[in-house]
């Protein structure tokens, strides 16, 4: 007769590992008692537990509630047992001693390997902004056995490095990606994936990133000046500008007060019906957490009337 | 047929020492934990030591901690156990005992005991 | 450390007789309780261990049970070559104690 069994048992952290060891002997062969051991090099042997063919299974004080028999049914030369709730410490070298009638011992081993998968982590680099050089976005680790694989994925482009850390039973990934921040940027999705034998599928971890800056403003509304005479309703100014985070506004005027009855909404200025005071030099001021930019326009009301007097010299000149 | 032949018993002063050997046959001795039992005169069986079965671990009844020391040496299948400081309450005929396996702590086989004598 | 006392210390018994021996541990130790037979003038002899699994060659007529603290030795027919001392071991930890021992004769 022989022992079947396997070189190598792998289970994934707090599964039940089942251990086989199956006698193939000839027939009227019996197994009486099968033991099984923990036999690590270094680690010193630890008794798991003795399986009588009579009296069924004694379990080792150290394995105690943890070692128990497959479910039935059950061959009578099947010495297999299952170990409960694996752990990263129960990973090592196992042997099976089987007690046959009339053929005597015989002996195997097995590895149990126990996969420890990745709890991943990501941080996020310093805060983005415009025109900084090449600046870390994030940073993703994961800690696992064997060793998890930590990737990118992303349209953005950047640069990844990738470094180790091993422990005893386990090994730590960190990969960081650098990119040049620019607001084309900002809202893309930046996704840590790690791969791991112990997972059933990747885990992926998203950031969305966010890079900091302010536009250049503009102030629309004097397009046409014909449009900005006295009397007219519903002039306004729009101060134009984008930025992340949002920027603020606020209007001033250059030189002096603004004009009463002038109403400030924002990013618009809105004027009551235009005289000539309201002519003059308008400031808007464009703030976020990262800048600050201004944009000035000059407003001159005009006076039909003087314009039409105007003409007239004008053709008369002529 | 397993053997286990023990040696070096003895009258031996109180104070003085003593080294008890076990010469072992018939099994893979480096595959099994031994230990020593005693027993007084007319008395019961007393666990004394422990080694296991690759001499890193061992473990010693209350009684004899610091006095007695319990090792093997594998190349030779034999056990020994060092006895110093004796005294009268160390008589006793001396067993030694294989383990069921590596560290079970129960004894399939014993040996036929030295008895070792302490007395002035 | 635990202790494990024995009853009754000796008894005497007709060749036929159900004799029955307990163990009694001072704390709880699972089934890690081993019997041991010595007869006069002979070295221990395992009979038993896990509270109940008999060792290779021991007569079926010896038996034991019980779990935790309190364990049992039965011989279902007591024969004159049992005449001898029995003792019980915990060995679920260090110190791996004995039983006092209980001698057994034929009346």
């Known amino acids: 007769g022989e022992l079947e069994t396997s070189d190598v048992v792998t289970v994934v952290l707090g599964q039940d590992a089942k251990l086989p060891c199956f006698y193939r002997g000839d027939s009227g062969e019996q197994v009486g008692q099968v033991a099984w051991a923990r036999v690590d090099a270094g680690e010193g042997a630890q008794e798991l537990a003795l399986l009588h063919s009579k009296y069924g299974l004694h379990v080792s004080p150290a394995y105690e509630g943890r070692v128990e028999q497959p479910p039935p049914p059950r061959n009578p030369l099947d010495g297999s047992v299952l170990l409960r709730n694996a752990v990263q410490a129960d990973e090592g070298e196992y042997e099976c001693r089987v007690s046959t009638f009339p053929a005597g011992s015989f002996q195997a081993r097995l590895r149990l390997r126990v996969l420890v998968p990745p709890l991943p982590s990501l941080n996020p680099g310093p805060a983005l902004e415009e025109g900084q050089g090449l600046t870390l976005a994030a940073s993703c680790t994961a800690e696992g056995s064997p060793a998890p694989s930590v990737t990118w994925d992303t349209e953005v482009k950047g640069t990844t490095s990738s470094r180790s850390f091993k422990h005893s039973r386990s090994a730590a990934v960190t990969s960081e990606f650098h990119l040049v921040p620019s607001r084309s940027m900002n809202g893309q999705p930046l996704t840590c994936v790690v791969s791991h034998p112990g997972l059933l599928q990747d885990q992926r971890i998203t950031h969305i990133l966010h890079v900091s800056f302010l536009a250049e403003a503009s102030v629309r509304g004097l397009e046409d000046q014909n449009l900005w005479h006295i009397g007219r309703e519903g002039a306004m100014l729009k101060c134009l500008s984008e930025g992340q985070p949002p920027p603020s506004y606020n209007w001033t005027r250059l030189d002096g007060p603004l004009p009463s009855g002038v109403r400030v909404d924002g990013d618009t200025l809105g004027f009551p019906p235009l005289t000539t005071e309201h002519s003059g030099i308008y400031v808007c001021h464009v703030s976020n957490e990262f800048s600050s930019r201004d944009s000035q326009v000059t407003v001159d009301v005009l006076d039909p009337q003087e314009d039409s007097g105007k003409q007239v010299d004008l053709v008369s000149a002529s | 047929e397993v053997q286990l032949l023990e040696s070096g018993g003895g009258v031996v002063q109180p104070g003085r020492s003593l080294r008890l050997s076990c010469a072992a046959s018939?099994?893979?001795?480096?595959?099994?934990?031994m230990h020593w039992v005693r027993q007084a005169p007319g008395k019961g069986l007393e666990w004394v030591a422990v080694?296991?079965?690759?001499?890193?671990?061992?473990y010693y009844a209350d009684s004899v901690k610091g006095r007695f020391t319990i090792s093997r040496d594998n190349s030779k299948n034999t056990l020994y156990l060092q006895m110093n400081s004796l005294r009268a309450e160390d008589t006793a005929v001396y067993y030694c005992?294989?383990?069921?396996?590596?560290?079970?702590?129960?004894?399939?086989?014993w040996g036929q005991g030295t008895l070792v004598t302490v007395s002035s | 450390d635990i202790v494990m006392t024995q009853s009754p210390s000796s008894l005497s018994a007709s060749v036929g007789d159900r004799v029955t021996i307990t163990c009694r541990a001072s704390?709880?130790?699972?089934?890690?309780l081993a019997w041991y037979q010595q007869k006069p003038g002979k070295v221990p002899k395992l009979l038993i261990y896990?509270?109940?699994t008999l060792q290779s060659g021991v007569p079926s007529r010896f038996s034991g049970s019980g779990s935790g603290t309190d364990f049992t030795l039965t011989i279902s027919s007591l024969q004159p070559e049992d005449v001898a001392t029995y003792y019980c071991?915990?060995?679920?930890?260090?110190?791996?104690?004995f039983g006092q021992g209980t001698k057994v004769e034929i009346k």
């Open positions: 080694i296991s079965y690759d001499g890193s671990n061992k």
């Open positions: 896990a509270a109940s």
């Open positions: 071991q915990k060995y679920n930890s260090a110190p791996y104690t």
């Open positions: 018939g099994f893979t001795f480096s595959s099994y934990g």
């Open positions: 005992a294989k383990d069921y396996g590596y560290n079970w702590n129960f004894f399939d086989y």
């Open positions: 704390q709880g130790i699972s089934n890690y």
